[in-house]
């Protein structure tokens, strides 16, 4: 009951709080349980006790073990245990489950991700935030005090978020990272059979031979974040990648927008240097979700150049 798991990475700072609470005036003694050896309070030590806090500055794998804290008052003693595990830094991007803090959920209206354990440290803004090891960039992400705010949250925002900050102790700086999963829950959303807004079914698009042309497939799937929604193009019933015409490419990455609260996606098909044979192809805009698939077909026709003599 009065035992707490704590973990950290080697060469980072780790600060652990005694699981037994007491008034600030109470003294707290810390011991390494395996040897019953007292933890020093002198700050010159790499591992030292500071009241209710046990500080590893920085932590080493060999520090792993169970630490005992005894909160002493004039009338009673309370004992707690801190089970500390220090892990080697991972060479790859994957953050293993044992380094994860509790998962948090967010929605369109509330998307705060708090940096775990940060209140134990002496840190100064700004926090750095990473998602799946990539630094977060863009106006949708705002590092605010000890948490991250994500604007216009969508399903794709789910993932593992890591905060990184610097702990300062007597002028010395130590790095700290902490990772937690973020899940996105739908608020009063709904899903419907895909509705393709563009192109219109059996639309004829005029193009000029030798010029570039863009076709946009745009569809809406319901309100709020959608678990499964995709738009893509096919040529003559074949995947773009399998069709084997390098001049015709699907734009990588689907743009998501919220139109009147509806979740919509679009995908651009780029045709470089339009050729006569492109006019013979059937271009299918496909929209897919959990309900099923909708298809709108487009064909190209030659745009007659303006006769400047008339």
């Amino acid at each position: 009951k009065f035992s707490k798991q704590s973990w950290g990475l080697e060469n980072e700072a780790l600060i652990v709080r005694c699981p037994r609470q007491g008034k600030p005036s109470y003294t707290v003694d810390w011991y390494y349980s395996q040897t019953n050896k007292s933890i020093p309070t002198q700050e010159r030590n790499r591992v030292f006790a500071s009241g209710q806090l046990l500080k590893f500055l920085p932590a080493a794998v060999a520090d792993s073990g169970i630490y005992t804290c005894i909160v002493r008052s004039p009338t009673f003693n309370r004992t707690g245990y801190a089970n500390v595990t220090i892990y080697k830094k991972q060479s790859d991007c994957n953050v293993p489950d044992y380094l994860m803090y509790s998962t948090v959920s967010g929605s369109e209206k509330n998307s705060k991700i708090y940096c775990p354990t940060i209140d134990l440290y002496n840190w100064t803004a700004p926090l750095e935030w990473f998602k799946n090891c990539q630094a977060l960039q863009g106006s949708r992400y705002r590092a605010h005090k000890s948490f991250l705010v994500i604007d216009n949250v969508m399903t794709e925002d789910a993932g593992d978020y890591t905060c990184k900050f610097i702990h300062n102790e007597n002028g010395a700086n130590y790095s700290v990272t902490a990772t937690r999963s973020f899940t996105v829950k739908d608020e009063q959303g709904f899903s419907l059979f895909p509705v393709i807004g563009a192109p219109a079914q059996n639309e004829i698009k005029e193009v000029e031979i030798g010029k570039n042309a863009n076709l946009t497939c745009s569809a809406c799937f319901g309100k709020g974040t959608q678990f499964l929604a995709a738009v893509l193009w096919q040529l003559n019933g074949t995947k773009i990648t399998d069709f084997g015409e390098p001049r015709i490419q699907q734009e990588e990455g689907q743009n998501q927008s919220f139109s009147n609260g509806l979740a919509c996606l679009d995908m651009v098909l780029r045709i470089a240097d339009v050729k006569e044979e492109d006019l013979l192809l059937q271009y299918d805009c496909l929209a897919l979700n959990l309900h099923g698939l909708r298809r709108h077909t487009v064909r190209l026709s030659r745009k007659n150049p303006i006769d400047h003599h008339s």
């Epitope: 019933g237 299918d284 309900h291 099923g292 077909t297």
Partner: nanobody, 121 residues
Framework: EVQLVESGGGLVQPGGSLRLSCAAS????????MGWFRQAPGKERELVAV???????KYADSVKGRFTISADNSKNTAYLQMNSLKPEDTAVYYC???????????????WGQGTLVTVSS
Amino acid sequence: EVQLVESGGGLVQPGGSLRLSCAASGRTPSIIAMGWFRQAPGKERELVAVIIDSRTTKYADSVKGRFTISADNSKNTAYLQMNSLKPEDTAVYYCAAVGGATTVTASEWDWGQGTLVTVSS
């Protein structure tokens, strides 16, 4: 219409692995996406994993990092590799596919009969 037949289900201990297969026949060239859904007793059917256009994959949060969906187009088969299985993964697993001829403007998912996965010690 696409016909789907699942295989590979069974009883496995927690922490164990299973590989489900889904063989598609019929109008297979028209398949745009294949997915695995599951339904536990007394619960709604939920999407576990989907592969779109043979390359884009999507997973339910509860299985991320443990399950992997893949497809072999030459065999018209989809697979679900399930590792680190938990008792809560116990369910009937259904394979589903969606596509349709180029003349069809709208089509729903086609379903297999399902295969039972039981995770228990």
